[in-house]
Interface confidence: medium
């Protein structure tokens, strides 16, 4: 004689005003846990959203974003417009990264280039709107007499081919 509602399984709801105590969730609704008093309305993936997983009686639909947009928030609650690499999304749309900043993704904001000199290093490859700078060894590391991180290769005797 245990509480009937607590035994209504996922996919049903407790509706003891009808001929059945546990009634199946109506179309376009679900209950993911047992003992529910109501079924939840299925999420609809419309507009910029597209369906990744259909709703079932026991689980909600899951949405993705259509091409040209990407998901934001928990369970893809929002879709945000993609930009090109080297751009960021502003209120006025996609704008190129300002000089000294970059964005290597289709989402997010432009970030400043790494300041190599803060680590005592030099710029090996210049940054672009799409790529960060590549830092190389410090100028001191390249000066004559500086200890090398890797030992010099042994000299080969003439006439011997490499092993």
């Amino acid at each position: 004689l245990q509480d009937l509602c607590s035994n209504c399984p996922a996919g049903t709801f407790c509706d003891n005003n009808r001929s059945q105590i546990c009634s199946p969730c109506p179309p376009n609704s679900f209950s993911s846990a047992g003992g529910q008093r109501t079924c939840d309305i299925c999420r609809q993936c419309k507009g910029v959203f597209k369906t990744r997983k259909e709703c079932s009686s026991t689980s909600n639909a899951e949405c993705d974003c259509i091409s040209g947009y990407h998901c934001l928030g928990a369970e893809c609650s929002m879709c945000e417009q993609d930009c090109k690499q080297g751009q960021e999304l502003t209120k006025k749309g996609c704008k190129d990264c300002c000089f000294g900043t970059f964005n290597d993704q289709k989402r997010g904001i432009c970030r400043p280039w790494t300041n190599c000199s803060l680590d005592g290093k030099s710029v090996l490859v210049n940054g672009t709107k799409e790529r960060d700078v590549v830092c190389g060894p410090s100028p001191a590391d390249l000066s004559p007499g500086a200890s090398s991180a890797t030992p010099p290769a042994p000299a080969r005797e003439p006439g011997h081919s490499p092993q």
Epitope: L1, Q2, D3, L4, C5, N7, C8, P9, N16, N17, R18, S19, Q20, I21, C22, G34
Partner: antibody, heavy 113, light 111 residues
Framework: QSLEESGGDLVKPGASLTLTCTAS?????????MCWVRQAPGEGLEWIAC????????PHYASWAKGRFTISQTSSTTVTLQMTSLTAADTATYFC??????WGPGTLVTVSS | AQVLTQTASPVSAAVGGTVTINCQSS???????LSWYQQKPGQPPKRLIY???TLASGVPSRFKGSGSGTQFTLTISDLECDDAATYYC????????????FGRGTEVEVK
């Protein structure tokens, strides 16, 4: 927490009687699943009816009890069972139960002329 | 109305032994709504098992419920004198009328 039934009596066939189940140590203001079960002398258990307290849900009845027996919540600590047109076959100990795990000691109803 | 048929009474076993009580429902119980109750003379029933196999609070693990659909079993192992009682199965059904039904009970004797 405990339950106690009251109202059991010796009545004549055709009479009506109301049994009361009183809760101690808890109240029916929150949702509880309350049932009445009876047991004729030397016989087995027989389910009568159940109701959700604190809820407008339809009570559940055994088909033989529907129309002659009425279960209802009458206060935050009492559930009643109204019985009409009693016959000798209704002679039994009547138990109330909460969620199937808490039971009262029972009250005896005897129908005899 | 639903009918629950239990093992005929009495069932006898010695202290330390094992008894098995079967319960067959005339129709499938809903979502494993099956309970087992123990009753001693002059006392109300005591729930041992609910949802077919879940042990009620404070009940020794010597009591074990199993089964699904229409066939259920209560097994009592390491039998004690105190286990002498009548055991009832109760089934729950997904209908507002005749929601529950009890079996007729099985008396267990401990020798």
């Amino acid at each position: 927490q405990s339950l106690e039934e009251s109202g059991g009596d010796l009545v004549k066939p055709g009479a009506s009687l109301t049994l009361t189940c009183t809760a101690s140590g808890f109240s029916f203001s929150s949702r509880h699943y309350m049932c009445w079960v009876r047991q004729a002398p030397g016989e087995g258990l027989e389910w009568i009816a159940c109701i959700y307290t604190g809820s407008s849900g339809t009570p559940h009845y055994a088909s033989w009890a529907k129309g002659r027996f009425t279960i209802s919540q009458t206060s935050s600590t009492t559930v009643t069972l109204q019985m009409t047109s009693l016959t000798a076959a209704d002679t039994a100990t009547y138990f109330c139960s909460s969620e199937g795990n808490l039971w009262g000691p029972g009250t005896l109803v005897t129908v005899s002329s | 109305a639903q009918v629950l048929t239990q093992t005929a009474s009495p069932v006898s076993a010695a202290v330390g032994g094992t008894v098995t009580i079967n319960c067959q429902s005339s129709q499938s119980v809903y979502s494993n709504w099956l309970s087992w109750y123990q009753q001693k003379p002059g006392q109300p029933p005591k729930r041992l098992i609910y949802s077919a196999s879940t042990l009620a609070s404070g009940v020794p693990s010597r009591f074990k419920g199993s089964g699904s659909g229409t066939q259920f079993t209560l097994t009592i192992s390491d039998l004690e004198c105190d286990d002498a009682a009548t055991y009832y199965c109760a089934g729950g059904y997904n209908t507002v009328t005749d929601t529950f039904a009890f079996g007729r009970g099985t008396e267990v004797e401990v020798k």
